[in-house]
Interface confidence: medium
Protein backbone atom coordinates (compact mmCIF):
# COMPACT_ATOMS: atom_id res chain seq x y z
CA UNK A 1 0.00 0.00 0.00
CA UNK A 2 1.16 3.51 -0.67
CA UNK A 3 0.49 6.82 -2.37
CA UNK A 4 1.64 8.25 -5.69
CA UNK A 5 2.02 12.01 -5.36
CA UNK A 6 2.09 14.56 -8.17
CA UNK A 7 2.93 18.23 -7.68
CA UNK A 8 2.20 20.60 -10.57
CA UNK A 9 4.68 23.48 -10.57
CA UNK A 10 3.51 25.39 -13.62
CA UNK A 11 1.31 25.16 -16.67
CA UNK A 12 1.45 27.76 -19.40
CA UNK A 13 2.22 28.59 -22.99
CA UNK A 14 5.37 26.88 -24.22
CA UNK A 15 8.26 28.78 -25.74
CA UNK A 16 8.19 29.82 -29.36
CA UNK A 17 5.77 31.54 -31.70
CA UNK A 18 2.13 30.56 -31.94
CA UNK A 19 1.83 29.91 -28.22
CA UNK A 20 -1.68 30.63 -26.93
CA UNK A 21 -2.15 33.73 -24.83
CA UNK A 22 -4.89 32.32 -22.64
CA UNK A 23 -6.32 28.95 -21.66
CA UNK A 24 -9.83 30.42 -21.77
CA UNK A 25 -11.91 30.47 -24.90
CA UNK A 26 -13.53 33.64 -26.14
CA UNK A 27 -16.66 32.70 -24.20
CA UNK A 28 -15.42 34.14 -20.94
CA UNK A 29 -13.53 33.28 -17.76
CA UNK A 30 -12.38 29.78 -16.89
CA UNK A 31 -10.36 27.95 -14.32
CA UNK A 32 -7.89 25.10 -14.58
CA UNK A 33 -7.59 21.77 -12.88
CA UNK A 34 -5.68 18.56 -13.44
CA UNK A 35 -6.51 14.90 -13.66
CA UNK A 36 -3.88 12.20 -13.20
CA UNK A 37 -4.24 8.62 -14.33
CA UNK A 38 -1.84 5.77 -13.52
CA UNK A 39 -1.59 2.57 -15.52
CA UNK A 40 0.82 -0.29 -14.78
CA UNK A 41 3.64 -1.23 -17.14
CA UNK A 42 5.42 0.59 -19.93
CA UNK A 43 3.56 -0.87 -22.88
CA UNK A 44 1.62 1.28 -25.32
CA UNK A 45 -1.82 0.76 -23.87
CA UNK A 46 -5.07 1.79 -25.46
CA UNK A 47 -5.92 5.27 -24.26
CA UNK A 48 -9.35 4.04 -23.18
CA UNK A 49 -7.94 1.38 -20.87
CA UNK A 50 -8.82 2.06 -17.24
CA UNK A 51 -6.49 3.78 -14.81
CA UNK A 52 -5.78 0.44 -13.15
CA UNK A 53 -3.34 1.88 -10.60
CA UNK A 54 -5.68 4.74 -9.74
CA UNK A 55 -6.69 8.24 -10.70
CA UNK A 56 -7.13 11.58 -9.00
CA UNK A 57 -8.52 15.00 -9.72
CA UNK A 58 -7.13 18.27 -8.41
CA UNK A 59 -9.18 21.04 -6.90
CA UNK A 60 -10.17 23.77 -9.31
CA UNK A 61 -7.80 26.71 -9.59
CA UNK A 62 -8.76 30.36 -9.19
CA UNK A 63 -10.89 32.00 -11.87
CA UNK A 64 -8.79 33.32 -14.74
CA UNK A 65 -10.03 36.13 -16.98
CA UNK A 66 -7.96 37.13 -19.97
CA UNK A 67 -6.94 40.80 -20.11
CA UNK A 68 -6.69 41.48 -23.85
CA UNK A 69 -3.92 44.08 -23.66
CA UNK A 70 -1.93 42.72 -20.74
CA UNK A 71 0.97 40.30 -21.17
CA UNK A 72 0.01 36.69 -20.50
CA UNK A 73 0.59 36.10 -16.77
CA UNK A 74 1.39 32.84 -15.03
CA UNK A 75 -1.80 30.84 -15.01
CA UNK A 76 -3.35 30.43 -11.57
CA UNK A 77 -3.11 26.80 -10.50
CA UNK A 78 -4.92 24.74 -7.89
CA UNK A 79 -3.14 24.34 -4.56
CA UNK A 80 -1.83 21.11 -3.16
CA UNK A 81 -0.73 17.69 -4.25
CA UNK A 82 -2.61 15.20 -6.34
CA UNK A 83 -2.52 11.94 -4.45
CA UNK A 84 -3.33 8.55 -5.93
CA UNK A 85 -3.50 5.81 -3.29
CA UNK A 86 -2.52 2.31 -4.42
CA UNK A 87 -3.54 -0.76 -2.46
CA UNK A 88 -1.24 -3.39 -3.91
CA UNK A 89 2.44 -3.48 -4.79
CA UNK A 90 3.94 -0.47 -6.54
CA UNK A 91 4.83 -1.84 -10.00
CA UNK A 92 8.00 0.22 -10.53
CA UNK A 93 7.18 0.73 -14.21
CA UNK A 94 4.04 2.66 -15.01
CA UNK A 95 2.36 5.06 -17.40
CA UNK A 96 1.56 8.50 -16.05
CA UNK A 97 -1.15 10.48 -17.84
CA UNK A 98 -1.66 14.08 -16.76
CA UNK A 99 -4.59 15.97 -18.21
CA UNK A 100 -5.09 19.72 -17.90
CA UNK A 101 -8.74 20.66 -18.08
CA UNK A 102 -10.47 24.00 -18.09
CA UNK A 103 -13.85 24.59 -16.56
CA UNK A 104 -15.74 27.11 -18.69
CA UNK A 105 -17.59 29.53 -16.48
CA UNK A 106 -19.60 31.38 -19.14
CA UNK A 107 -23.20 30.42 -19.78
CA UNK A 108 -23.22 26.85 -21.09
CA UNK A 109 -26.16 25.11 -22.64
CA UNK A 110 -26.45 21.88 -20.70
CA UNK A 111 -24.70 23.11 -17.60
CA UNK A 112 -21.02 23.52 -16.73
CA UNK A 113 -18.55 22.29 -19.33
CA UNK A 114 -15.03 20.91 -19.12
CA UNK A 115 -12.60 21.15 -22.02
CA UNK A 116 -9.34 19.24 -22.27
CA UNK A 117 -6.42 21.63 -22.86
CA UNK A 118 -3.49 19.25 -22.77
CA UNK A 119 -2.68 15.63 -22.14
CA UNK A 120 0.83 14.34 -21.49
CA UNK A 121 1.75 10.68 -21.19
CA UNK A 122 5.01 9.48 -19.66
CA UNK A 123 6.19 5.91 -19.36
CA UNK A 124 8.47 5.81 -16.36
CA UNK A 125 10.45 3.62 -14.01
CA UNK A 126 10.18 4.77 -10.42
CA UNK A 127 11.03 3.07 -7.14
CA UNK A 128 8.82 3.78 -4.16
CA UNK A 129 10.49 5.67 -1.35
CA UNK A 130 12.82 7.57 -3.65
CA UNK A 131 13.17 11.35 -3.97
CA UNK A 132 10.90 13.57 -6.05
CA UNK A 133 11.45 13.14 -9.79
CA UNK A 134 11.08 16.31 -11.85
CA UNK A 135 9.84 16.61 -15.39
CA UNK A 136 8.98 19.18 -18.04
CA UNK A 137 6.58 18.07 -20.79
CA UNK A 138 5.11 19.80 -23.81
CA UNK A 139 1.64 19.06 -25.11
CA UNK A 140 0.88 21.01 -28.26
CA UNK A 141 1.50 24.65 -27.49
CA UNK A 142 1.44 24.13 -23.71
CA UNK A 143 4.23 23.34 -21.28
CA UNK A 144 3.74 21.50 -17.99
CA UNK A 145 6.33 21.33 -15.20
CA UNK A 146 5.76 18.81 -12.45
CA UNK A 147 7.34 16.53 -9.84
CA UNK A 148 6.21 13.12 -8.70
CA UNK A 149 7.11 10.33 -6.32
CA UNK A 150 5.71 7.12 -4.88
CA UNK A 151 5.87 6.46 -1.16
CA UNK A 152 4.80 3.55 0.98
CA UNK A 153 2.18 3.91 3.66
CA UNK A 154 0.92 2.01 6.66
CA UNK A 155 3.39 -0.79 7.44
CA UNK A 156 4.73 -1.30 3.93
CA UNK A 157 8.40 -0.76 3.07
CA UNK A 158 10.72 -1.40 0.14
CA UNK A 159 10.89 -0.14 -3.43
CA UNK A 160 7.59 -1.87 -4.25
CA UNK A 161 5.93 -1.33 -0.84
CA UNK A 162 5.55 -5.09 -0.51
CA UNK A 163 7.64 -5.81 2.58
CA UNK A 164 5.52 -5.49 5.68
CA UNK A 165 6.74 -4.34 9.06
CA UNK A 166 5.02 -5.24 12.30
CA UNK A 167 4.78 -2.41 14.84
CA UNK A 168 6.30 -3.03 18.23
CA UNK A 169 6.25 -1.15 21.48
CA UNK A 170 9.25 -2.79 23.13
CA UNK A 171 12.48 -4.33 21.86
CA UNK A 172 11.35 -7.77 23.03
CA UNK A 173 8.58 -7.74 20.42
CA UNK A 174 11.12 -8.29 17.66
CA UNK A 175 11.21 -12.04 17.86
CA UNK A 176 13.90 -14.45 16.67
CA UNK A 177 15.22 -13.56 13.23
CA UNK A 178 13.56 -10.16 13.20
CA UNK A 179 15.48 -6.91 13.05
CA UNK A 180 14.45 -3.26 13.20
CA UNK A 181 13.25 -1.84 9.88
CA UNK A 182 15.51 0.90 8.55
CA UNK A 183 15.05 3.75 9.04
CA UNK A 184 12.17 3.33 11.50
CA UNK A 185 13.41 1.77 14.68
CA UNK A 186 9.93 1.15 16.03
CA UNK A 187 9.09 -1.51 13.49
CA UNK A 188 10.29 -5.01 12.76
CA UNK A 189 10.75 -7.00 9.61
CA UNK A 190 12.22 -10.30 8.55
CA UNK A 191 15.68 -9.64 7.17
CA UNK A 192 16.53 -10.87 3.67
CA UNK A 193 18.79 -13.91 3.46
CA UNK A 194 22.26 -12.61 2.55
CA UNK A 195 24.80 -14.35 0.36
CA UNK A 196 26.13 -17.50 2.01
CA UNK A 197 29.17 -16.68 4.14
CA UNK A 198 28.49 -12.92 4.25
CA UNK A 199 30.07 -11.59 7.43
CA UNK A 200 27.46 -11.17 10.15
CA UNK A 201 29.60 -8.48 11.76
CA UNK A 202 30.79 -6.46 8.79
CA UNK A 203 28.28 -7.21 6.04
CA UNK A 204 24.59 -6.68 5.47
CA UNK A 205 22.06 -7.02 2.67
CA UNK A 206 18.90 -5.31 1.55
CA UNK A 207 18.08 -7.82 -1.18
CA UNK A 208 18.34 -11.59 -0.85
CA UNK A 209 21.67 -13.03 -2.01
CA UNK A 210 23.70 -9.83 -1.80
CA UNK A 211 26.49 -8.94 0.60
CA UNK A 212 27.21 -5.25 1.12
CA UNK A 213 30.06 -4.17 3.35
CA UNK A 214 30.07 -1.73 6.20
CA UNK A 215 32.61 1.07 6.02
CA UNK A 216 36.13 -0.19 6.56
CA UNK A 217 35.48 -3.68 5.17
CA UNK A 218 35.68 -5.15 1.70
CA UNK A 219 35.75 -8.42 -0.21
CA UNK A 220 32.90 -10.50 -1.59
CA UNK A 221 31.90 -11.56 1.92
CA UNK A 222 33.05 -8.38 3.72
CA UNK A 223 35.77 -10.24 5.60
CA UNK A 224 38.78 -8.19 4.41
CA UNK A 225 39.64 -5.02 6.36
CA UNK A 226 39.72 -2.19 3.81
CA UNK A 227 43.00 -0.82 5.17
CA UNK A 228 44.81 -4.05 4.28
CA UNK A 229 43.21 -4.53 0.90
CA UNK A 230 45.66 -3.85 -1.89
CA UNK A 231 42.71 -3.27 -4.21
CA UNK A 232 41.17 -0.38 -2.34
CA UNK A 233 40.04 2.46 -4.53
CA UNK A 234 40.38 0.51 -7.78
CA UNK A 235 37.47 -0.25 -10.02
CA UNK A 236 36.83 -2.25 -13.12
CA UNK A 237 37.04 -5.90 -14.08
CA UNK A 238 38.58 -8.36 -11.64
CA UNK A 239 42.15 -9.50 -12.34
CA UNK A 240 42.55 -13.27 -12.42
CA UNK A 241 46.10 -13.17 -11.06
CA UNK A 242 45.72 -10.89 -8.08
CA UNK A 243 42.02 -11.13 -7.36
CA UNK A 244 42.12 -7.35 -7.38
CA UNK A 245 40.08 -4.92 -9.38
CA UNK A 246 41.88 -3.41 -12.34
CA UNK A 247 41.31 0.33 -12.75
CA UNK A 248 38.52 1.03 -15.20
CA UNK A 249 36.62 4.12 -16.32
CA UNK A 250 34.71 5.73 -13.45
CA UNK A 251 31.24 7.21 -13.76
CA UNK A 252 32.66 10.72 -13.25
CA UNK A 253 35.42 10.38 -15.83
CA UNK A 254 34.98 13.12 -18.41
CA UNK A 255 32.66 14.97 -15.98
CA UNK A 256 29.12 14.28 -17.16
CA UNK A 257 27.80 17.30 -15.25
CA UNK A 258 27.06 20.29 -17.46
CA UNK A 259 27.03 24.01 -16.64
CA UNK A 260 29.80 23.85 -14.05
CA UNK A 261 28.24 21.08 -12.00
CA UNK A 262 30.58 18.96 -9.91
CA UNK A 263 30.45 15.17 -10.12
CA UNK A 264 30.65 12.73 -7.25
CA UNK A 265 30.56 8.96 -7.59
CA UNK A 266 27.78 6.89 -6.07
CA UNK A 267 27.61 3.08 -6.09
CA UNK A 268 27.41 2.20 -9.78
CA UNK A 269 26.52 5.72 -10.86
CA UNK A 270 27.25 9.40 -10.27
CA UNK A 271 25.61 12.46 -8.79
CA UNK A 272 25.88 16.04 -9.98
CA UNK A 273 25.89 18.97 -7.59
CA UNK A 274 24.54 21.80 -9.73
CA UNK A 275 25.29 25.51 -9.46
CA UNK A 276 22.40 27.83 -8.77
CA UNK A 277 20.02 28.21 -11.67
CA UNK A 278 20.54 24.66 -12.97
CA UNK A 279 19.08 21.30 -12.12
CA UNK A 280 18.49 17.89 -13.66
CA UNK A 281 20.51 14.67 -13.60
CA UNK A 282 23.41 16.38 -15.39
CA UNK A 283 22.60 20.03 -14.47
CA UNK A 284 21.28 20.38 -17.98
CA UNK A 285 18.05 22.27 -17.16
CA UNK A 286 18.51 26.02 -16.86
CA UNK A 287 16.59 29.27 -16.67
CA UNK A 288 14.91 28.23 -13.48
CA UNK A 289 13.06 30.71 -11.27
CA UNK A 290 11.06 30.31 -8.08
CA UNK A 291 7.97 29.84 -10.23
CA UNK A 292 9.41 26.50 -11.30
CA UNK A 293 9.53 25.26 -7.71
CA UNK A 294 13.22 24.33 -7.79
CA UNK A 295 13.65 23.83 -4.05
CA UNK A 296 13.17 20.25 -2.92
CA UNK A 297 12.30 18.85 0.49
CA UNK A 298 10.32 21.87 1.63
CA UNK A 299 13.07 24.40 0.86
CA UNK A 300 12.01 28.04 0.72
CA UNK A 301 12.67 29.71 -2.63
CA UNK A 302 13.75 33.35 -2.70
CA UNK A 303 14.39 35.27 -5.92
CA UNK A 304 18.09 36.02 -6.39
CA UNK A 305 19.44 39.55 -6.15
CA UNK A 306 21.51 39.33 -9.33
CA UNK A 307 20.88 37.83 -12.79
CA UNK A 308 23.41 35.05 -12.19
CA UNK A 309 21.39 33.62 -9.33
CA UNK A 310 17.76 33.48 -10.44
CA UNK A 311 16.77 31.97 -7.11
CA UNK A 312 18.20 30.88 -3.78
CA UNK A 313 16.88 27.90 -1.82
CA UNK A 314 16.82 28.20 1.95
CA UNK A 315 16.90 24.60 3.08
CA UNK A 316 15.09 23.15 6.08
CA UNK A 317 17.13 21.40 8.75
CA UNK A 318 18.56 18.16 7.48
CA UNK A 319 18.95 19.19 3.83
CA UNK A 320 21.59 21.02 1.83
CA UNK A 321 22.64 21.70 -1.74
CA UNK A 322 21.70 24.51 -4.11
CA UNK A 323 18.25 22.92 -4.48
CA UNK A 324 18.01 21.33 -0.99
CA UNK A 325 18.33 18.04 -2.84
CA UNK A 326 20.93 16.46 -0.54
CA UNK A 327 20.16 15.02 2.86
CA UNK A 328 22.67 16.10 5.48
CA UNK A 329 24.28 13.14 7.21
CA UNK A 330 23.56 14.43 10.67
CA UNK A 331 24.82 11.20 12.18
CA UNK A 332 28.35 12.08 11.03
CA UNK A 333 28.45 14.51 13.97
CA UNK A 334 28.12 11.47 16.26
CA UNK A 335 25.41 12.95 18.47
CA UNK A 336 24.69 9.69 20.30
CA UNK A 337 26.73 9.28 23.43
CA UNK A 338 27.92 6.17 25.26
CA UNK A 339 28.19 4.11 22.07
CA UNK A 340 24.57 4.69 20.95
CA UNK A 341 23.63 3.94 17.32
CA UNK A 342 22.50 7.03 15.37
CA UNK A 343 19.46 6.84 13.06
CA UNK A 344 18.59 9.76 10.79
CA UNK A 345 14.84 9.45 10.24
CA UNK A 346 14.67 12.54 8.03
CA UNK A 347 12.26 14.42 10.26
CA UNK A 348 14.40 13.77 13.33
CA UNK A 349 17.49 12.09 14.66
CA UNK A 350 17.06 9.13 16.94
CA UNK A 351 19.60 7.31 19.03
CA UNK A 352 19.32 3.61 19.73
CA UNK A 353 21.06 3.27 23.08
CA UNK A 354 23.19 0.45 24.35
CA UNK A 355 21.89 -1.52 27.31
CA UNK A 356 22.12 0.52 30.48
CA UNK A 357 21.79 3.92 28.78
CA UNK A 358 18.78 6.08 27.96
CA UNK A 359 17.75 9.57 26.96
CA UNK A 360 17.39 11.32 23.58
CA UNK A 361 21.17 11.13 23.08
CA UNK A 362 21.84 8.11 25.37
CA UNK A 363 23.23 10.54 27.90
CA UNK A 364 21.65 8.94 30.96
CA UNK A 365 23.35 5.96 32.56
CA UNK A 366 20.47 3.93 33.92
CA UNK A 367 22.79 2.10 36.30
CA UNK A 368 24.14 5.27 37.93
CA UNK A 369 21.66 5.13 40.77
CA UNK A 370 21.11 1.37 40.92
CA UNK A 371 21.72 0.17 44.45
CA UNK A 372 23.00 3.57 45.53
CA UNK A 373 20.81 5.30 48.10
CA UNK A 374 21.15 8.93 49.11
CA UNK A 375 20.83 9.32 52.86
CA UNK A 376 18.63 11.70 54.84
CA UNK A 377 15.93 12.12 52.17
CA UNK A 378 18.32 12.98 49.34
CA UNK A 379 17.41 12.03 45.75
CA UNK A 380 19.73 10.37 43.26
CA UNK A 381 20.44 12.08 39.91
CA UNK A 382 22.16 9.93 37.30
CA UNK A 383 24.45 11.18 34.56
CA UNK A 384 27.82 10.77 32.96
CA UNK A 385 28.41 7.32 34.38
CA UNK A 386 28.45 8.49 37.98
CA UNK A 387 25.67 9.21 40.40
CA UNK A 388 25.07 12.44 42.27
CA UNK A 389 22.84 13.13 45.24
CA UNK A 390 20.61 16.16 45.51
CA UNK A 391 20.49 16.56 49.29
CA UNK A 392 17.70 17.76 51.54
CA UNK A 393 18.18 20.99 53.47
CA UNK A 394 20.76 20.66 56.21
CA UNK A 395 22.69 17.82 54.60
CA UNK A 396 25.54 17.60 52.13
CA UNK A 397 28.31 15.41 50.82
CA UNK A 398 28.33 12.73 48.09
CA UNK A 399 25.66 10.62 49.78
CA UNK A 400 24.01 13.36 51.92
CA UNK A 401 25.45 11.75 55.05
CA UNK A 402 27.23 14.89 56.24
CA UNK A 403 25.37 17.42 58.32
CA UNK A 404 25.53 20.79 56.54
CA UNK A 405 25.33 24.16 58.27
CA UNK A 406 22.55 26.04 56.52
CA UNK A 407 23.88 29.27 58.02
CA UNK A 408 27.35 28.86 56.49
CA UNK A 409 26.39 30.87 53.41
CA UNK A 410 25.24 33.83 55.57
CA UNK A 411 21.74 33.84 54.10
CA UNK A 412 20.26 36.55 56.36
CA UNK A 413 20.55 40.04 54.88
CA UNK A 414 21.00 43.40 56.55
CA UNK A 415 22.71 42.05 59.68
CA UNK A 416 20.05 39.47 60.45
CA UNK A 417 21.14 36.57 62.63
CA UNK A 418 20.89 33.01 61.33
CA UNK A 419 19.75 30.04 63.40
CA UNK A 420 19.93 26.44 62.20
CA UNK A 421 16.58 24.71 62.55
CA UNK A 422 15.34 21.15 61.96
CA UNK A 423 13.63 22.16 58.72
CA UNK A 424 16.21 24.60 57.48
CA UNK A 425 17.14 27.96 58.91
CA UNK A 426 15.53 30.91 60.62
CA UNK A 427 16.60 34.53 60.28
CA UNK A 428 16.19 36.93 63.21
CA UNK A 429 16.11 40.30 61.49
CA UNK A 430 17.72 43.48 62.68
CA UNK A 431 15.31 46.34 63.50
CA UNK A 432 13.89 47.91 60.35
CA UNK A 433 13.97 44.71 58.26
CA UNK A 434 11.68 41.77 57.70
CA UNK A 435 11.19 38.77 55.42
CA UNK A 436 12.40 35.19 55.44
CA UNK A 437 15.90 36.47 54.63
CA UNK A 438 15.43 39.95 56.20
CA UNK A 439 15.38 41.27 52.64
CA UNK A 440 12.54 43.80 52.98
CA UNK A 441 13.05 47.21 54.64
CA UNK A 442 10.25 48.33 56.92
CA UNK A 443 8.91 51.92 56.58
CA UNK A 444 9.01 54.10 59.72
CA UNK A 445 5.23 53.97 59.95
CA UNK A 446 5.41 50.21 60.30
CA UNK A 447 4.28 49.38 56.75
CA UNK A 448 6.68 47.29 54.73
CA UNK A 449 7.85 48.43 51.30
CA UNK A 450 7.11 45.00 49.84
CA UNK A 451 4.67 42.21 50.71
CA UNK A 452 3.13 42.53 54.16
CA UNK A 453 4.15 40.22 56.98
CA UNK A 454 1.86 37.23 57.41
CA UNK A 455 -0.80 37.54 60.09
CA UNK A 456 0.59 36.99 63.59
CA UNK A 457 4.11 38.19 62.78
CA UNK A 458 5.25 41.68 63.66
CA UNK A 459 8.07 43.39 61.82
CA UNK A 460 11.27 42.46 63.58
CA UNK A 461 9.98 39.02 64.68
CA UNK A 462 12.20 36.12 63.69
CA UNK A 463 10.93 34.80 60.32
CA UNK A 464 10.93 31.06 60.01
CA UNK A 465 12.15 29.92 56.60
CA UNK A 466 9.96 27.06 55.45
Amino acid sequence: AGVFELQIHSFGPGPGPGAPRSPCSARGPCRLFFRVCLKPGLSEEAAESPCALGAALSARGPVYTEQPEAPAPDLPLPNGLLQVPFRDAWPGTFSLIIETWREELGDQIGGPAWSLLARVTRRRRLAAGGPWARDIQRAGAWELRFSYRARCELLAVGTACTRLCRPRSAPSRCGPGLRPCAPLEDECEAPPVCRAGCSLEHGFCEQPGECRCLEGWTGPLCTVPASTSSCLGLRGPSSATTGCLVPGPGPCDGNPCANGGSCSETPGSFECTCPRGFYGLRCEVSGVTCADGPCFNGGLCVGGADPDSAYICHCPPGFQGSNCEKRVDRCSLQPCRNGGLCLDLGHALRCRCRAGFAGPRCEHNLDDCAGRACANGGTCVEGGGAHRCSCALGFGGRDCRERADPCAARPCAHGGRCYAHFSGLVCACAPGYMGSRCEFPVHPDGVSALPAAPPGLRPGDPQRYL
Epitope: F33, R35, C37, A47, E48, S49, P50, C51, G54, A55, A56, L57, S58, A59, R60, V84, P85, E99, W101, Q108, G110, G111, P112, A113, W114, S115, L116
Partner: nanobody, 129 residues
Framework: QVHLMESGGGSVQAGGSLRLSCAAS????????MGWFRQAPGKEREGIAT????????YYADSVKGRFTISQDNAKNTVYLQMNSLKPEDTAMYYC??????????????????????WGQGTQVTVSS
Protein backbone atom coordinates in the same frame (compact mmCIF):
# COMPACT_ATOMS: atom_id res chain seq x y z
CA GLN B 1 -18.74 -5.73 -9.55
CA VAL B 2 -19.91 -2.12 -9.20
CA HIS B 3 -23.21 -1.62 -7.39
CA LEU B 4 -25.07 1.60 -6.57
CA MET B 5 -28.09 1.49 -4.27
CA GLU B 6 -30.43 4.46 -3.79
CA SER B 7 -32.80 4.92 -0.85
CA GLY B 8 -34.81 7.66 0.83
CA GLY B 9 -37.46 8.36 -1.82
CA GLY B 10 -41.13 8.73 -1.03
CA SER B 11 -44.12 11.04 -1.12
CA VAL B 12 -44.09 14.49 0.40
CA GLN B 13 -46.13 17.69 0.36
CA ALA B 14 -44.88 20.73 -1.54
CA GLY B 15 -42.46 22.70 0.61
CA GLY B 16 -41.36 19.54 2.41
CA SER B 17 -37.95 17.83 2.54
CA LEU B 18 -36.44 14.45 1.70
CA ARG B 19 -32.94 13.04 1.95
CA LEU B 20 -31.77 10.54 -0.64
CA SER B 21 -28.80 8.21 -0.07
CA CYS B 22 -26.65 6.35 -2.57
CA ALA B 23 -24.33 3.62 -1.29
CA ALA B 24 -21.51 2.52 -3.62
CA SER B 25 -19.84 -0.86 -3.41
CA UNK B 26 -17.08 -2.39 -5.52
CA UNK B 27 -16.30 1.07 -6.88
CA UNK B 28 -13.08 3.10 -6.76
CA UNK B 29 -15.20 5.87 -5.39
CA UNK B 30 -12.51 8.46 -4.72
CA UNK B 31 -11.30 8.79 -8.29
CA UNK B 32 -14.49 9.94 -9.97
CA UNK B 33 -17.78 11.81 -9.71
CA MET B 34 -20.97 10.60 -8.14
CA GLY B 35 -24.09 12.38 -9.26
CA TRP B 36 -27.85 12.52 -8.94
CA PHE B 37 -29.98 12.50 -12.06
CA ARG B 38 -33.75 12.49 -12.39
CA GLN B 39 -36.23 11.52 -15.06
CA ALA B 40 -39.87 12.55 -15.09
CA PRO B 41 -42.34 10.58 -17.25
CA GLY B 42 -42.00 11.57 -20.90
CA LYS B 43 -38.91 13.72 -20.25
CA GLU B 44 -35.16 13.33 -20.75
CA ARG B 45 -32.95 12.30 -17.90
CA GLU B 46 -31.37 15.44 -16.38
CA GLY B 47 -28.45 15.94 -14.05
CA ILE B 48 -29.26 17.85 -10.90
CA ALA B 49 -26.18 17.58 -8.68
CA THR B 50 -22.79 15.89 -8.77
CA UNK B 51 -19.79 15.72 -6.46
CA UNK B 52 -16.18 14.58 -6.78
CA UNK B 53 -15.33 12.91 -3.52
CA UNK B 54 -11.57 13.42 -3.73
CA UNK B 55 -11.74 17.22 -3.82
CA UNK B 56 -15.42 17.86 -3.01
CA UNK B 57 -16.01 19.67 -6.31
CA UNK B 58 -19.78 20.12 -6.70
CA TYR B 59 -22.09 21.19 -9.52
CA TYR B 60 -25.83 21.91 -9.41
CA ALA B 61 -28.45 22.40 -12.08
CA ASP B 62 -29.99 25.88 -12.03
CA SER B 63 -33.41 24.39 -11.26
CA VAL B 64 -32.28 23.08 -7.85
CA LYS B 65 -29.60 25.60 -6.80
CA GLY B 66 -30.20 26.84 -3.27
CA ARG B 67 -32.74 24.08 -2.53
CA PHE B 68 -30.76 20.86 -2.95
CA THR B 69 -27.42 20.00 -1.38
CA ILE B 70 -25.16 17.11 -2.36
CA SER B 71 -22.76 15.73 0.26
CA GLN B 72 -20.64 12.66 0.90
CA ASP B 73 -19.42 10.30 3.57
CA ASN B 74 -16.15 8.88 2.28
CA ALA B 75 -15.88 6.35 5.08
CA LYS B 76 -19.25 4.82 4.09
CA ASN B 77 -18.80 5.29 0.32
CA THR B 78 -22.15 7.06 0.37
CA VAL B 79 -23.44 10.21 -1.31
CA TYR B 80 -26.50 12.10 -0.09
CA LEU B 81 -28.93 14.54 -1.70
CA GLN B 82 -30.73 16.78 0.76
CA MET B 83 -33.84 18.17 -0.96
CA ASN B 84 -35.59 21.11 0.68
CA SER B 85 -38.49 23.32 -0.45
CA LEU B 86 -39.69 20.58 -2.77
CA LYS B 87 -42.02 21.52 -5.62
CA PRO B 88 -44.44 19.39 -7.64
CA GLU B 89 -42.14 19.70 -10.65
CA ASP B 90 -39.46 17.83 -8.67
CA THR B 91 -41.56 14.67 -8.99
CA ALA B 92 -39.45 12.08 -10.84
CA MET B 93 -37.48 8.90 -10.57
CA TYR B 94 -34.10 9.84 -9.00
CA TYR B 95 -31.01 7.92 -10.06
CA CYS B 96 -27.54 7.79 -8.57
CA UNK B 97 -24.67 7.51 -11.07
CA UNK B 98 -20.89 7.24 -10.94
CA UNK B 99 -18.30 8.15 -13.54
CA UNK B 100 -16.33 11.03 -14.96
CA UNK B 101 -14.74 12.28 -18.16
CA UNK B 102 -14.28 9.34 -20.56
CA UNK B 103 -10.64 8.41 -21.04
CA UNK B 104 -10.25 10.00 -24.48
CA UNK B 105 -12.76 12.80 -24.15
CA UNK B 106 -11.73 16.36 -24.86
CA UNK B 107 -15.03 17.80 -23.66
CA UNK B 108 -17.29 16.71 -20.82
CA UNK B 109 -20.41 18.00 -19.10
CA UNK B 110 -20.58 17.01 -15.41
CA UNK B 111 -24.39 17.30 -15.35
CA UNK B 112 -25.04 15.19 -18.44
CA UNK B 113 -25.28 11.38 -18.51
CA UNK B 114 -22.37 10.62 -20.91
CA UNK B 115 -19.32 9.57 -18.89
CA UNK B 116 -21.41 8.16 -16.05
CA UNK B 117 -20.87 4.44 -16.57
CA UNK B 118 -22.56 3.08 -13.46
CA TRP B 119 -26.19 3.62 -12.52
CA GLY B 120 -28.46 2.63 -9.69
CA GLN B 121 -32.00 1.29 -10.02
CA GLY B 122 -33.58 4.58 -8.95
CA THR B 123 -35.88 5.75 -6.17
CA GLN B 124 -39.20 7.48 -6.73
CA VAL B 125 -39.88 10.97 -5.36
CA THR B 126 -43.45 12.31 -5.53
CA VAL B 127 -44.28 15.87 -4.49
CA SER B 128 -47.96 16.72 -4.22
CA SER B 129 -49.43 20.19 -4.03
Amino acid sequence: QVHLMESGGGSVQAGGSLRLSCAASGYTYRSNFMGWFRQAPGKEREGIATIHSGVATTYYADSVKGRFTISQDNAKNTVYLQMNSLKPEDTAMYYCAAGGPPANADRWYPLRPPGYNYWGQGTQVTVSS
